[in-house]
Amino acid sequence: QNASRGRRQRRMHPNVSQGCQGGCATCSDYNGCLSCKPRLFFVLERIGMKQIGVCLSSCPSGYYGTRYPDINKCTKCKADCDTCFNKNFCTKCKSGFYLHLGKCLDNCPEGLEANNHTMECVNIVHCEVSEWNPWSPCTKKGKTCGFKRGTETRVREIMQHPSAKGNLCPPTNETRKCTVQRKKCQKGERGKKGRERKRKKPNKGESKEAIPDSKGLESSKETPEQRENKQQQKKRKVQDKQQKSVSVSTVH
C-alpha cells in the first residue's frame, strides 16, 4: 500500500521517496512527510522559513489530535489557548486569558473571580469563622483579683480565609467590660489570667496543696474566695444569655 502511494506521488513530485524517515508513509525532499503511517498524526513543523510535514505519535503543545477515517492530523488550538483537549475545550490559556469551563476569557464572568496564579476563573470564597469561644474570666491588668471593674474577652477562629473578591472576615476578638465582687489577692498571687492557671512554685513555708491549679479548683480544698469567684462566673453566664451587653470589638 505504501509503495503504491509512493509511486503515485513520484509522478506528482519528482523527489518523492519510499524510504521515508520515522512514521511517514510517503515523503519528499522538499515537503518532508506527505502522508503518515496509520495512527500517526501529521503536523507541519516550521524549520526557519520553511514548513515541512512530520508524523508524530502525539501532537505537540498548542495542538490537539483530530482523527478521521485513515487520516489523522494535529490541529491548532484556538488563538487564545496554549493546550487543548479539542477545538472547543482548552486546558491552559495563553498569557492574559483566564480559563473557565474550557474557554479562555479576557475577564471572568459575574460571580467568579480571576486567580492570577492558576489563571483560572474560580468561585468567590467568602470568609468563614467559627462560633465564639466562651468569655474569658474578668481581668484587669492581667490579674483576676484586686479589682471590681475589668474586661473579659472572647475569640473565634477563621475557618476559611476569603478570596480577593470575597467578604472580609469579621472581628475575631471581642472585649467587653465586666464587674465582679472585689476579692483580695492572696499573698504572691499573680492574677492567673484567663484559663491558663500556671503552677507556681510555693513560697517558703507554703504547702503545694495550698496553691490551687486547674485540678485544685475542682477539689474539695477550695478557698472561700475561689468559691465566690466561681459563683460570680456562673452569674455572668446567666446575665450573658438574658441581655446583650455593650461590647467593644477589636479586629486582630
Partner: antibody
Framework: EVQLVESGPGLVKPSETLSLTCTVS????????WNWIRQPPGKGLEWIGY???????YQNPSLKSRVTISRDTSKNQFSLKLSSVTAADTAVYYC?????????????WGQGTLVTVSS | DIQMTQSPSSLSASVGDRVTITCKAS??????LSWFQQKPGKAPKTLIY???RLVDGVPSRFSGSGSGTDYTLTISSLQPEDFATYYC?????????FGQGTKVEIK
C-alpha cells in the same frame, strides 16, 4: 498520469437515489483518498465525502444521512449514492483524489458529470 | 464548520495587471489552504497547496501567502489564459469547505 472518469445517469427523478461511479486509471484506489465534490449550475463547490485507501468513509455532515460511498477494488472504481434527491441536488458531480496533508489537495479531478433532478 | 469568505466575488482586469484575491477563514486554518482555477465547463485545477506551494507545472506568476485566518492568491502579471474563476479550499478539518469563488474577467 492518473485519470478519473465519472459515469451514471444524467437525469434522476425527485425522491429517487442518484448513483454515480468513478473509474480510476494510473493508480490504485487502495492508496490515497477518493472524493466526491459537486457544483450546482452557476454556483460554488461543495465537498461531499471520501473513501480511504482501506475502504473507510467520511461524509459531509450536511449530507451524511443521504450519502453512501463505496468501492470495488477489482474494477478500481468507487461510487456515490445520494438518496431522496430534490431539485437542490442538481449539479455537476466530480470525483477527485488527494494523498495526504503534505501533498496537493485534489491534485486530480474527473471531467465531471451533470446530474439533473427533475420529474 | 469552518466558513471561507472569498473576496472580491468578481473583478475586471487587463492583461499584465497584478491581481489579488483573498480568502478569510472563520478560524485559524494553520496554512491548510489550496487555490483552484476553474474555466467554464471544465473541472477545477489545483494551483497552490499548503498556502504557498505551487503544484508542478503551474506558472510562477501564481503565488500564495497568508497564515492564521487570512490568505491571498496573487497573479503577478495576468495572462489571457488566466481569465477564470478561482476558489480557495481549507482542509484543516472535515468537512472541507470552499470559498464562494472569484470570477476574473477581462476589462
Amino acid at each position: 498520469e492518473v485519470q478519473l472518469v465519472e459515469s451514471g445517469p444524467g437525469l434522476v427523478k425527485p425522491s429517487e437515489t442518484l448513483s454515480l461511479t468513478c473509474t480510476v486509471s494510473g493508480d490504485s484506489i487502495t492508496s490515497g483518498y477518493w472524493n466526491w465534490i459537486r457544483q450546482p449550475p452557476g454556483k460554488g463547490l461543495e465537498w461531499i465525502g471520501y473513501i480511504s485507501y482501506s475502504g473507510k468513509t467520511y461524509q459531509n455532515p450536511s449530507l451524511k444521512s443521504r450519502v453512501t460511498i463505496s468501492r470495488d477494488t477489482s474494477k478500481n472504481q468507487f461510487s456515490l449514492k445520494l438518496s431522496s434527491v430534490t431539485a437542490a441536488d442538481t449539479a455537476v458531480y466530480y470525483c477527485a483524489t488527494y494523498y495526504g496533508y503534505g501533498g496537493p489537495w485534489f491534485a486530480y479531478w474527473g471531467q465531471g458529470t451533470l446530474v439533473t433532478v427533475s420529474s | 464548520d469552518i466558513q471561507m469568505t472569498q473576496s472580491p466575488s468578481s473583478l475586471s482586469a487587463s492583461v499584465g495587471d497584478r491581481v489579488t484575491i483573498t480568502c478569510k477563514a472563520s478560524q485559524d486554518i494553520d496554512s491548510y489552504l489550496s487555490w483552484f482555477q476553474q474555466k467554464p465547463g471544465k473541472a477545477p485545477k489545483t494551483l497552490i497547496y499548503l498556502t504557498n506551494r505551487l503544484v508542478d507545472g503551474v506558472p510562477s506568476r501564481f503565488s500564495g501567502s497568508g497564515s492564521g485566518t487570512d490568505y491571498t492568491l496573487t497573479i503577478s502579471s495576468l495572462q489571457p489564459e488566466d481569465f477564470a474563476t478561482y476558489y480557495c479550499l481549507h482542509y484543516d478539518e472535515f468537512p472541507l469547505t470552499f470559498g464562494q469563488g472569484t470570477k476574473v474577467e477581462i476589462k
